[in-house]
């Protein structure tokens, strides 16, 4: 496969964020903007949050675990301790008024997640307008499922539990065909959930593929030795195409499709990304070295989270070498076209220009949004800034940038996207939108020569390096 | 780095008592759900016991009202103990810890074990 990637080029990093320090969201003027950007427009988002939404904010503690997950349905949910609040977030002609309901997940030892809460809706378009029209199911982690066939009856909803010995940790809750879910543990076992009008939810297992690890039951694998306790294939992330009906995983070692009808599903292939990938990574962040050889044993790679768009699967991906001084964890996004039966061979790699200092792995917390499927424009982003790039796959490119939500108080809950446009929840300043100004998009082939032209100021925040090494990698903080 | 160090298994008499212990470091404590499993060579691993966030706690039915699990958050150790043992309780126990992280993901980690042994 080719690998391409990017010229080691920054755009500006230095500017700090003008974010209010105020802990509790405000929204005095619809729209306003929210923190200084060079080539982005950073704005609220929406009409004003609900007041249930702006409580839960407000009297959550600092070290409360607030989750969110926002639906390309245009509904937002809000997971603050046992509750559950989800609101629709893109106003239409239909809705004039937000909708806004509470609901009581089930109890749980674990935290509650928004991972663990997925929406479906009845209207084929993937939206709805109306609590009537929107189904939901939650999970938590030990596998208690509760379920309401309508968001318009808080108090109409069914039980089960998924029974795997207490083996197993969920991760991911996913909405799929046919008003279906799949639950996913952190072990990669996958569950479809099936409602049916009697109120029973149906489950069953996903098939895996034959004659792989990965579908290997735990009782035989452990009489040959495969697995010891701690070395379980982890879980990063989960993508259904509503499309192509077809469901993907994303683990430490492989990517797994699955194709999916109404109450069935075909395990379509495992594909073994250490052995696809980690070469393309590597020469595309270390290539250069002279002592290429020598390095390429000594690296790490972590698959974090996986999206798509128009020219397929995004995976991304850190990289980092122990011996570097100093030690850079390198994002980079991967993009692999899916044949249907199996994965392409031409693989494109973009090394973003985000590049943190390496602490642990247990920091590298990274996720991708990816919000218009027509284009290659995707957001990195963790709990302190937005880091805006591309997949390197097209014609025209937006400038790199990291948008900082660093004032006090403030944190990145999640993100998400509603109708192409990208959607930051910040527990300061609730949804915000990331929109590029007018005339910002620029050739890809030009990127050098105009970050190059470019002149900051002797007082200027703003910054601009030319580099060609990987070695002259300017240190971003985290 | 994510530590978890599990002592206090043994060998010992049926209807003996051990108490296991799981010291932990890199994690805040108070905010882990620890579980304590068992592996017996060719079976599958069996959660034993968990210790939630609230403090709650929960047992496999093959252990309740013999084995009780408790935490320490200032010393970071979790503590499983063991008592009416009997020979088919034996097995390496091994200390899990679950941590909720940055946007709610989960973040698993495990300890080498600690083997009990029961005799009849």
């Known amino acids: 496969g080719s690998a391409v990637s990017s010229p080691v080029l920054f755009s500006p990093v230095g500017r700090r964020s003008s974010l209010s320090s105020r802990g509790t969201p405000t929204r005095m003027f619809p729209h306003h903007s929210i923190t200084e950007s060079v080539n982005y427009d950073v704005k609220t988002f929406g009409s004003s949050l609900p007041v249930k939404v702006m409580e839960a904010l407000t009297l959550a503690e600092v070290d409360d675990q607030l989750t969110i997950n926002i639906d390309e349905g245009g509904w937002a949910c809000l997971v603050c301790k046992e509750k559950l609040i989800i609101w629709k977030i893109a106003l239409s002609p239909i809705t004039k008024l937000s909708v806004c309901k509470e609901l009581q997940l089930p109890p749980s030892d674990f935290h509650w997640s928004a991972d663990l809460v997925a929406l479906s809706y009845s209207s084929p378009s993937g939206e709805a307008h109306s609590t009537q029209a929107v189904a939901v199911m939650v999970a938590t982690r030990e596998g208690s499922i509760r379920y309401w066939p309508s968001l318009a009856g808080e108090d109409t909803y069914t039980e089960a539990f998924v029974d795997s010995g207490g083996d197993k940790t969920y991760s991911f809750l996913t909405a799929v065909q046919g008003g279906s879910f799949i639950l996913s543990s952190s072990g990669s076992q996958l569950i479809r959930l099936i409602p049916e009008s009697s109120g029973k939810i149906h489950q069953h297992i996903l098939p895996q593929g034959q004659g792989m690890l990965s579908g290997i039951g735990r009782k035989v694998s452990s009489l040959f030795g495969i697995l010891s306790p701690s070395s379980d294939l982890t879980l990063s992330s989960v993508l259904w195409d509503r499309e192509r009906s077809s469901f993907y995983s994303l683990t430490s070692s492989n990517i797994s499709k699955w194709e999916l009808d109404d109450s069935s599903e075909k395990h379509a292939y495992s594909w073994d990304i250490n052995r696809a990938l980690k070469e393309n990574i590597t020469d595309a962040i270390w290539g250069s070295e002279s002592n290429y050889e020598a390095i390429k044993e000594g690296v790490n790679i972590r698959y974090l989270d996986l999206k798509q768009n128009c020219d397929g699967l995004v995976i991304l991906a850190a990289a980092w070498h122990s011996a570097d001084n100093p030690c850079l964890i390198y994002y980079s996004l991967i993009t692999i076209e899916d044949n249907g039966c199996q994965m392409s061979d031409a693989v494109t790699v973009e090394v973003t220009q985000y590049n943190p200092p390496f602490q642990s792995e247990d920091l590298i917390l990274c996720q991708l949004t990816v919000p218009n499927f027509s284009n290659q424009t995707a957001y990195l982003y963790n709990e302190s800034a937005v880091y805006v790039c591309s997949t390197g796959t097209g014609k025209f490119s937006l400038p790199q940038e990291k948008i900082v939500f660093n004032a006090q108080g403030d944190s990145v809950l999640g993100a998400g996207a509603c109708g192409g446009v990208p959607i930051i929840f910040s527990r300061n300043s609730g949804l915000v939108s990331i929109t590029s100004r007018e005339n910002v998009s620029i050739l890809a082939e030009d990127l050098e020569g105009s970050l190059a032209s470019s002149v900051a100021g002797p007082n200027s925040e703003s910054m601009i390096f030319e580099t060609t090494t990987k070695n002259e990698t300017i240190a971003q903080e985290d | 780095q994510v530590q978890l160090v599990e002592s206090g298994g043994g060998l010992v008499q049926a209807g003996g008592s051990l108490r296991l212990a799981c010291a932990t470091s890199?994690?805040?404590?108070?905010?882990?759900?620890m579980d304590w499993y068992r592996q017996i060579p060719g079976k599958q691993r069996e959660l034993v016991a968990r210790?939630?966030?609230?403090?709650?706690?929960t047992y496999a039915d093959f252990v309740k009202g013999r084995f009780t699990v408790s935490r320490e958050n200032e010393n970071n150790t979790v503590y499983l103990q063991m008592n009416s043992l009997q020979p088919e309780d034996a097995g390496l126990y091994v200390c899990?810890?679950?941590?909720?992280?940055?946007?709610?993901?989960?973040?698993?980690?495990w300890g080498q074990g600690t083997q009990v042994t029961v005799s009849s």
């Open positions: 210790t939630g966030i609230r403090d709650s706690a």
């Open positions: 899990k810890a679950a941590v909720t992280g940055v946007f709610g993901r989960l973040s698993e980690h």
């Open positions: 890199g994690i805040l404590l108070s905010k882990a759900v």
